[in-house]
Amino acid sequence: QAAPFPELCSYTWEAVDTKNNVLYKINICGSVDIVQCGPSSAVCMHDLDTRTYHSVGDSVLRSATRSLLEFNTTVSCDQQGTNHRVQSSIAFLCGKTLGTPEFVTATECVHYFEWRTTAACKKDIFKANKEVPCYVFDEELRKHDLNPLIKLSGAYLVDDSDPDTSLFINVCRDIDTLRDPGSQLRACPPGTAACLVRGHQAFDVGQPRDGLKVVRKDRLVLSYVREEAGKLDFCDGHSPAVTITFVCPSERREGTIPKLTAKSNCRYEIEWITEYACHRDYLESKTCSLSGEQQDVSIDLTPLAQSGGSSYISDGKEYLFYLNVCGETEIQFCNKKQAAVCQVKKSDTSQVKAAGRYHNQTLRYSDGDLTLIYFGGDECSSGFQRMSVINFECNKTAGNDGKGTPVFTGEVDCTYFFTWDTEYACVHHHHHH
């Protein structure tokens, strides 16, 4: 049986059940290389409390559809009066990066995961030439996830004192020059994740090979190497390589750009101080507030919730968008869709799409940007579920009793972007995490 998601095959992936202090290792095409789980385990559960290992999915007992992968085992689970076996179930959804498997829940018999990934899309529009896992768990099982930094088009310009060259990088995947052919990037070779531009020429100085690594608490490292043979004439016989170290700052701060810290014989060392390198619980909340010791800030957007069936309305030329954030009030136009953002076509109001659901909510504060994300909306033709990204700005003189109002700014591949000036986005900082 052919591997259902070949892009995901090259790596052993990790997911965590924080509630029970359990680390899962997942290899969807072969077996995980953990002796204690046996030679054919595809899903290996490491109980960190008891320091024991249990196979909860066997690679030989795999069954697959386009959106679901199940691994059975021969291990009985003691559900009274049944002969059920322990199994793992991975539901796949279309995403814009390789993404990460997320532990959802577990019953006596089944361990459930969900994975939003380019590998599950109906079309190849989000697929990279080369992409590597872009997250890592530290020794305390806290997740550090750089997926939000991945550019689907274009690249980051590295801060470098050399006026004759420009070094462009992407995070965890190659630079897509076709979707956003900026003049300088146009000459970059396909597959490069680190592109050195000198005058009108561009050179591949690194491609992603291994996934993100954690070197010590709050320092993550990504290494790129030039795959093909053939040295560049300005590298003094050395093969080019790029090392990017992502550093979680010691306290809250605005974002910075990546900086070149060392360069020798085409070996480039880059340091990037960014809060995306911090653990995810420091940056994100599933509710509309971020507060407490862990986050160093106090943010509460719950006063933006609308009651009594009214919604915020944002004009998007062809469409009207109805928004109801930080609550579970049904939007009238989007009845029964559990939408937080509802897209209605002006010329045909029967064409209604959920552009993100209220129970699929993430509030993120990172590098000085406050963002509310609603995902899991109605599918587009690519298989990607519509989502909305609302970027908040602090405005102490916002109208509408300080609440302000959302403004639609554009759409890219079924992701809808809004800005929202409001006094409730004014962040109160604590100090040190």
């Epitope: 509630k19 359990v22 689970c77 322990v86 577990a106 006596e108 018999c109 361990h111």
Partner: nanobody, 116 residues
Framework: DVQLVESGGGLVQPGGSLRLSCAAS????????MDWYRQAPGKQREWVAT???????TYADSVKGRFTISRDNAKNTVYLQMNSLRPEDTAVYYC??????????WGQGTLVTVSS
């Protein structure tokens, strides 16, 4: 006050059965992972069984097929049903509760002696 109290230990003949109970107070019981451990005289404490907050169960190889862990959320109690007991099962049995928001909580233990 948060505490766990074990009961049900005692003297039993080889091949016999016992059911240990561990009653919890002061915690949201259903949110917690529950474990049973045991410590035989002169030996280190060893893990016996786990009942995760989601419901999955795992057992040490030495007790697999003989012991069953279960819980009653209404009574805030976790049980360890021990069948086909052997002399090497003789130990003090402890229950432990853990969750991301709590430090581990241990009971005071209950003695199980398997002897003819």
């Amino acid at each position: 006050d948060v505490q766990l109290v074990e009961s049900g230990g005692g003297l039993v003949q080889p091949g016999g059965s016992l059911r240990l109970s561990c009653a919890a107070s002061g915690i949201i019981f259903s949110d917690n992972r529950m474990d049973w451990y045991r410590q035989a005289p002169g030996k280190q404490r060893e893990w016996v069984a786990t009942l995760a907050s989601y419901g999955w169960k795992t057992y040490a190889d030495s007790v697999k097929g003989r012991f069953t862990i279960s819980r009653d959320n209404a009574k805030n109690t976790v049980y360890l049903q021990m069948n086909s007991l052997r002399p090497e099962d003789t130990a003090v049995y402890y229950c432990k509760a853990s969750s991301p928001v709590l430090n581990d909580i241990w009971g005071q233990g209950t003695l199980v002696t398997v002897s003819s």
